[in-house]
């Protein structure tokens, strides 16, 4: 992401195209406190930041609200007046789209549909991960719109489910970030549980007629 | 599926003024950056102007600076391009795009602007 | 606004070939560079952008590498419905077309 340049490495999150933080590690700078200007257009003078993150007590990043949520941010990290690392990236490119909201899930027999609302923007993956206590690994299934069916579940276990949005590559290239996992949601039965148990149930057995 | 349908080419002679039009579908026309970009006949393409998803900020390469100003109409999905002063190098198939990230993405099929006396 | 030199201008390759083309900026880019194929009436198609990224049914034999100020577009075995004039454009500082190269049959 951040070229090094005087030592300092940059990351960039453009959070849901509505507030980008820019983080740096500079170690040789490690004990000061540098600044951060920015401006979205070219031709306007720097703002400093006011709104910094900090890291033992010295400025590590900024964190600011987009005017739009597709722009260039122009930027410099300063130690006084001197520029340590100037660049300017467009932001789109560092995506990090907000977790799923409204989570919901709709059961068929052996199939689940699992919809959030979708995010106001597109070219994005909505990724439904699932397991149950029987999966050594959760499974994956990914759709364009937050509306994803699951099929060929077995009714007597227990599932854990989990939502996230990725954007996608082909669109805002490799470096975005995928959103947060929605929270883990346990089903059995078409109903919601607490939690699944660990360890799988042994099945009962078949009473004999 | 993204469509990109521009309109208000034709035969302008030298110092008149055009207006293009642009109508957007099948995605959500203010979140994106538009741009216009012309090809004169038998040449390369050349950026003609850009304008941002919603304050509406415009850019311009110097060939066209004061002379051409694109705009959006958010309610109807469309974008416009208003060219004054025109010249016989502006002779030109006008395309909209439709831009993320600085990128034309989506191309409509093009106008053709003749300048000509 | 930075300038785009591309080379060569015209290419002439027989179908399997491996071709190579290339784009240098008059500055760095940053590696904010796109490349766009079109054919002869049609408009531009997006093949390659952020210099290596394929679009989406872009096929795989076209490829894209480069930093600072120079880019290649390669295709690893051309095709007929490759011939066409690609152009590459940089959206580092202003955006900017390069003149193109032209892709023909030997």
């Known amino acids: 992401q951040g070229g090094a340049a005087e030592g300092v490495q940059i990351q960039i999150i453009y959070f849901n195209l509505e507030t980008v933080q820019v983080t740096w590690n500079a170690s040789k700078y490690s004990r000061t406190n540098l600044t951060f200007h920015y401006r979205f257009n070219g031709d306007e003078a720097y703002d400093q930041c006011t709104n910094y993150l900090l890291q033992e007590g010295h400025t590590s990043g900024c964190l600011l609200d987009a005017e739009q949520r597709d722009d260039i941010l122009y930027f410099s990290i300063r130690n006084g007046t001197h520029p340590v690392f100037t660049a300017s990236r467009w932001m789109v490119y560092y995506l990090k789209p907000s977790s799923p909201k409204h989570v919901r899930f709709s059961w068929h027999q052996d199939a689940v549909t699992v919809t959030c609302s979708d995010l106001s923007y597109g070219d994005l993956l909505y990724e439904v991960q699932y397991r149950s206590p029987f999966d050594t690994e959760w499974q994956s299934k990914q759709e364009n719109t937050c509306n994803v069916t699951i099929e060929g579940l077995d009714a007597e276990k227990c599932y854990s489910f989990w939502v996230r949005v990725k954007a996608m590559e082909d669109v805002y290239g490799p470096d975005t970030y995928p959103s947060d996992w929605s929270e883990v949601t346990c089903w059995q039965r078409g109903e919601i549980r607490d939690a699944c148990a660990e360890t799988p149930t042994p099945p009962k057995p078949k009473l004999s007629k | 599926e993204v469509q990109l349908v521009e309109s208000g080419g034709g035969l302008v002679q030298p110092g008149r003024s055009l207006r293009l039009s642009c109508v957007a579908s099948g995605f959500t026309f203010n979140n994106y950056w538009m741009t216009w970009v012309r090809q004169a006949p038998g040449k390369g393409l050349e950026w003609v102007a850009s304008i941002t998803d919603t304050s509406g900020r415009t850019y311009y390469p110097d060939s066209v600076k004061g002379r051409f100003t694109i705009s959006r109409d958010h309610a109807k999905s469309t974008l416009y391009l208003q060219m004054n002063s025109l010249r016989p190098e502006d002779t030109a198939t006008y395309y909209c795009?439709?831009?993320?990230?600085?990128?034309?993405?989506?191309w409509g099929q093009g106008v053709m602007v003749t300048v000509s006396s | 606004n930075i300038q785009l030199t591309q080379s060569p201008s015209l290419l002439s390759a027989s179908v399997g070939d491996r071709v190579t083309l290339s784009c240098k900026g008059s500055q760095n880019i940053n590696n904010y560079l796109a490349w766009y194929q079109q054919k002869l009436g049609e408009a531009p198609k997006l093949l390659i952008f952020k210099t290596n990224i394929l679009q989406t049914g872009i096929p795989l034999r076209f490829s894209g590498s480069g930093s600072g100020t120079d880019y290649t577009l390669t295709i690893s075995s051309l095709h007929c419905e490759d011939l066409a004039t690609y152009y590459c454009?940089?959206?580092?500082?202003?955006?900017?077309f390069g003149p193109g190269t032209k892709l023909e049959l030997k």
């Open positions: 795009t439709k831009t993320l990230g600085g990128i034309p993405r989506d």
């Open positions: 454009y940089q959206f580092n500082n202003g955006f900017t």
